[in-house]
C-alpha cells in the first residue's frame, strides 16, 4: 500500500475546503497549530483545525445527517402520502356514487318520494364521509336517522297518498312507530351491520396511513444529539484537520457511528414491522361486508328491498299506525293497494362490468406489497445511510475517526475512542421523547388494527340472528356479495374503475334504477296504484 500523503504544511487545502462551508477564513489557521482547545478532533500532532471550525463541522455534520435521513425516507414518505390522498379521494368517489345510485333508485322507483328522499339520502352520505374522516358519529344513529326520516314520507306519499294536510303533523309519531313496529323489518339492522363494519375498517385504514405519514415525518425531522454530532464530525471531518481531504471513512466505522446516532430511531423498527403486518392483515380482510366499496355501492338495493318490505306489509301497518298515530276523525282513504307491477318487469339499467379495471381492493394490495418492501426500513437505516454517504469499500485504507488505517478494526477503533466518549452510553440513553411518543402511537394503531373484528382466514363470520337473516353472509360468490341487484346489475367486483372519475361518475339520471315509465310487457300487479276506495284510519 502507498504511504499516507503528508499533512498539508500550509493548511491551504483545508482553508479552501472550509471556505465552502463558511465564507471567510478568519477561523482557519494558516499553518498547523497544536490544537489544544479542540474537543472532538483530538490531535495526535499539529492540526489545521480550530475550535470554531470544529463547531461549524458539528453543525454541518448534523445537517448532513438530517438530509441523508430525509432522502432515505423520501420514497417511503411519498408512497404513503400519495396513497393516503388517493384512498381518501377514492372513498369520497365511492360515497358520491353510492349517493347517486340511491337517489336514482328513488327517482326511478318512487318518484313521489324524491324531493325529501334526496335530502335524507344526502344527509346520510354526508355523515358517512365525515365518519370515514374520523368524525365522532355513531353509525347506528346514522342508519336509524335515515329510516326514521324516510318512513313518514313513505307513509304519507306511498301508503296514504290521499291523506289530508291536517293529518300531516304526525311525523314525530311515525318516526317513533318506525322503530316500535319494526316497520322496515330487519333491513335497518342488516345495513347497520354492513355499514358499521365496512366504515370502521375504512376509517382505521385511513388512520393507519396518516399515522404512517406522521411516523416518517417524525423520524424525518429528528434533531440529532450533540454526542451524535461529535461522532459524525469525527467520522466525516476530523480527517480534514490532518489535511487528509480525499480519505473516506471506513464502512464498518460508519455503521458503528450510525447505529449509535440512530439507536433511538431503530427502536421504532419492531413497531413499524408490526404496523405493516397488521395493516396487511386488515387489507386482506377488506372484502364483502368489510369492503366499503362493496357495501356502499350495494346500499341502494338493500334500501329498495326495505321499502318493498314496508309495501308488502302496508295493510297491517296502516291499520296499526292509524290507531297509534290517530287523529280526531277517522275516515277511510284506502282499503287496499293496487299492485303496480304484476307482469311489468321494469326497465333495468346495467352498469358496465369492467373486468380488468384497477379497483380499490387491488390498489390496497399493491400498496401493501410496496410497504412490505420497507418493512426493515428502520433497522436498515444505519446501513442505508452509510451506503449513501462516502465510505471506503472493503474497509481498506480508510479513516477510523482518529487516523488513516489500512484495515478497519472495530475493537481498535473503540479503544481509541474510549477517552473521547462512550458509544455504549450513547446507545443506552434511550429514544428521544418524540420517538417515544411515535412508538406509543404505533402501539395504539397496531392494537386497533389487531382488534378489528375482521374475518380470519377469509372465512365469513355468520351472524345468524333469531330473525332469520345472516348479516355477515351474502352467498357463495365473493365478488357479488352486496348489490348486484335488479336495480342496475352492478357487479361488485371491480365496481369502481379506480379514479377513472369521468368515465364513471354517475348523474342521478343515469344511475341504476327501474323506471316507472317502463314499457309494460304485461300488466303487472301493484297494490299501490290506481287506487279505489282505500282505507286510512287517519283523518
Amino acid at each position: 500500500q502507498p504511504p499516507p500523503p503528508p499533512p498539508d504544511a500550509t493548511c491551504h487545502q483545508v482553508r479552501s475546503f472550509f471556505q465552502r462551508l463558511q465564507p471567510g477564513l478568519k477561523w482557519v489557521p494558516e499553518t498547523p497549530v497544536p490544537g489544544s482547545d479542540l474537543q472532538v478532533c483530538l490531535p495526535k500532532g499539529p492540526t489545521c483545525c480550530s475550535r470554531k471550525m470544529e463547531e461549524k463541522y458539528q453543525l454541518t455534520a448534523r445537517l448532513n445527517m438530517e438530509q441523508l435521513l430525509q432522502s432515505a425516507s423520501m420514497e417511503l414518505k411519498f408512497l404513503i402520502i400519495q396513497n393516503a390522498a388517493v384512498f381518501q379521494e377514492a372513498f369520497e368517489i365511492v360515497v358520491r356514487h353510492a349517493k347517486n345510485y340511491t337517489n336514482a333508485m328513488f327517482k326511478n322507483n318512487y318518484p313521489s318520494l324524491t324531493p325529501q328522499a334526496f335530502e335524507f339520502v344526502g344527509e346520510f352520505f354526508t355523515d358517512v364521509s365525515l365518519y370515514i374522516l374520523g368524525s365522532d358519529i355513531n353509525v347506528d344513529d346514522m342508519v336509524n336517522e335515515l329510516f326514521d326520516s324516510l318512513f313518514p314520507v313513505i307513509y304519507t306519499q306511498l301508503m296514504n297518498p290521499g291523506l289530508p294536510d291536517s293529518a300531516l303533523d304526525i311525523n314525530e309519531c311515525l318516526r317513533g312507530a318506525r322503530r316500535d313496529l319494526k316497520v322496515f323489518g330487519n333491513f335497518p339492522k342488516l345495513i347497520m351491520t354492513q355499514v358499521s363494519k365496512s366504515l370502521q375498517v375504512t376509517r382505521i385504514f385511513l388512520q393507519a396511513l396518516n399515522l404512517g405519514i406522521e411516523v416518517i415525518n417524525t423520524t424525518d425531522h429528528l434533531k440529532f444529539s450533540k454526542d451524535c454530532g461529535r461522532m459524525l464530525t469525527r467520522m466525516w471531518y476530523c480527517s480534514y484537520c490532518q489535511g487528509l481531504m480525499m480519505v473516506k471513512p471506513c464502512g464498518g466505522y460508519c455503521n458503528v457511528v450510525m447505529q449509535g446516532c440512530m439507536a433511538g430511531v431503530v427502536e421504532i423498527d419492531k413497531y413499524w414491522r408490526e404496523y405493516i403486518l397488521s395493516l396487511e392483515e386488515l387489507v386482506n380482510g377488506m372484502y364483502r361486508i368489510y369492503d366499503m366499496e362493496n357495501v356502499l355501492l350495494g346500499l341502494f338495493s338493500t334500501i329498495h328491498d326495505s321499502i318493498q318490505y314496508v309495501q308488502k306489509n302496508a295493510g297491517k301497518l296502516t291499520t296499526t299506525i292509524g290507531k297509534l298515530c290517530a287523529h280526531s276523525q277517522q275516515r277511510q282513504y284506502r282499503s287496499a293497494y293496487y299492485p303496480e307491477d304484476l307482469f311489468i318487469d321494469k326497465k333495468v339499467l346495467k352498469v358496465a362490468h369492467v373486468e380488468h379495471e384497477e379497483t380499490l381492493s387491488s390498489r390496497r394490495r399493491e400498496l401493501i406489497q410496496k410497504l412490505k418492501s420497507f418493512i426493515s426500513f428502520y433497522s436498515a437505516l444505519p446501513g442505508y445511510i452509510c451506503s449513501h454517504s462516502p465510505v471506503a469499500e472493503n474497509d481498506t485504507l480508510c479513516w477510523n475517526g482518529q487516523e488513516l488505517v489500512e484495515r478497519y478494526s472495530q475493537k481498535a477503533a473503540r479503544n481509541g475512542m474510549k477517552n473521547q466518549f462512550n458509544l455504549h452510553e450513547l446507545k443506552m440513553k434511550g429514544p428521544e421523547p418524540v420517538v417515544s411518543q411515535i412508538i406509543d402511537k404505533l402501539k395504539h394503531i397496531n392494537q386497533l388494527l389487531r382488534t378489528m373484528s375482521m374475518p380470519k382466514g377469509r372465512v365469513l363470520d355468520k351472524n345468524l340472528d333469531e330473525e332469520g337473516f345472516e348479516s355477515g353472509d351474502c352467498g357463495d360468490d365473493e365478488d357479488e356479495c352486496i348489490g348486484g341487484s335488479g336495480d342496475g346489475m352492478i357487479k361488485v367486483k371491480n365496481q369502481l374503475r379506480f379514479l377513472a372519475e369521468l368515465a364513471y361518475d354517475l348523474d342521478v339520471d343515469d344511475a341504476p334504477g327501474n323506471s316507472q315509465q317502463a314499457t309494460p310487457k304485461d300488466n303487472e300487479i301493484s297494490t299501490f296504484h290506481n287506487l279505489g276506495n282505500v282505507h286510512s284510519p287517519l283523518k
Epitope: F187, S301, K312, G486, I525, T527
Partner: antibody, heavy 119, light 107 residues
C-alpha cells in the same frame, strides 16, 4: 316470460336433510322476493317464508323456523330451501313462488317438488 | 296469524251453473284478499287480488267481492276447465295465510 323451474322429487330418510332448488328466468331475479309454500296431500297451502335475493334477508313463518333455511345464489338466479331433521310430517309438495314488489301476491309459481320422507 | 276459513270445503256443480265460494278472516283485512285456482297435480294460479281485481288473462266470469272479514268468489257459467280447488289468501302482511280450500267437482 317469467318461469320458476324446481328440482325433481326427493325421497329421504327420517332425520335426513334435503335441499330443493328453484331456478328463476324471464325477469330480474333480485328485484322480487321468492316465497316457499308447503302443501300436504289433499290439504291447503302454508307459507314457509321468503327471501329477498338482493340482500339475502329472509323471513320465516314461526312454524317453520329451524325446519327450513332459505338461501339464494344471484349468479345462477336460483333460490334454495333446505329442510332439516325430516319427519313423515314433512312429506308434501313444496312450491316456490315469486311475489310482486309491494304485496304478498304470487302470480308466478314453480311446478312443485314432491318430498317423501320414509324409513 | 290471521286465520282463513273457507266454505264449503267441497261442492259439486254442472257446466253452465253459477257457484259462490266464501272466505272469512279472523280479523279485518280490508280488501287485502286474493283467490287462487289449483288443478290436480299443478301449481296454483292467481285469479283475483285486492278482493275484486282480476289480473290480465283471467276470464270475466270470475268475480270477487267483500271487504273487512267476509269475502266471496263467484264463478258465472261454469266451464269444464273451472273444476279444481280454490284457495283464498290474505296479502295484508306477513305471514300471508291461506284458507283450507274448496274443491269444486263436476256433478
Amino acid at each position: 316470460q317469467v318461469q320458476l323451474q324446481q328440482s325433481g322429487a326427493e325421497l329421504a330418510r327420517p332425520g335426513a336433510s334435503v335441499k330443493l332448488s328453484c331456478r328463476a328466468s324471464g325477469y330480474t331475479f333480485t328485484s322480487y322476493g321468492i316465497s316457499w309454500m308447503m302443501q300436504r296431500t289433499g290439504q291447503g297451502l302454508e307459507w314457509i317464508g321468503e327471501i329477498y335475493p338482493r340482500s339475502g334477508i329472509t323471513y320465516y313463518n314461526e312454524k317453520f323456523k329451524g325446519k327450513a333455511t332459505l338461501t339464494a345464489d344471484k349468479s345462477s338466479s336460483t333460490a334454495y330451501m333446505q329442510l332439516s331433521s325430516l319427519t313423515s310430517e314433512d312429506s308434501a309438495v313444496y312450491f316456490c313462488a315469486r311475489d310482486v314488489s309491494d304485496g304478498y301476491l304470487f302470480p308466478y309459481w314453480g311446478q312443485g317438488t314432491l318430498v317423501t320422507v320414509s324409513a | 296469524d290471521i286465520q282463513m276459513t273457507q266454505s264449503p270445503a267441497s261442492l259439486s256443480a254442472s257446466v253452465g251453473e253459477t257457484v259462490t265460494i266464501t272466505c272469512r278472516t279472523s280479523e279485518n283485512i280490508y280488501s287485502y284478499l286474493a283467490w287462487y285456482q289449483q288443478k290436480q297435480g299443478k301449481s296454483p294460479q292467481l285469479l283475483v287480488y285486492n278482493a275484486k281485481t282480476l289480473p290480465e288473462g283471467v276470464p270475466s266470469r270470475f268475480s270477487g267481492s267483500g271487504s273487512g272479514t267476509q269475502f266471496s268468489l263467484k264463478i258465472n257459467s261454469l266451464q269444464p276447465e273451472d273444476f279444481g280447488s280454490y284457495y283464498c289468501q290474505h296479502h295484508y302482511g306477513t305471514p300471508p295465510t291461506f284458507g283450507g280450500g274448496t274443491k269444486l267437482e263436476i256433478k
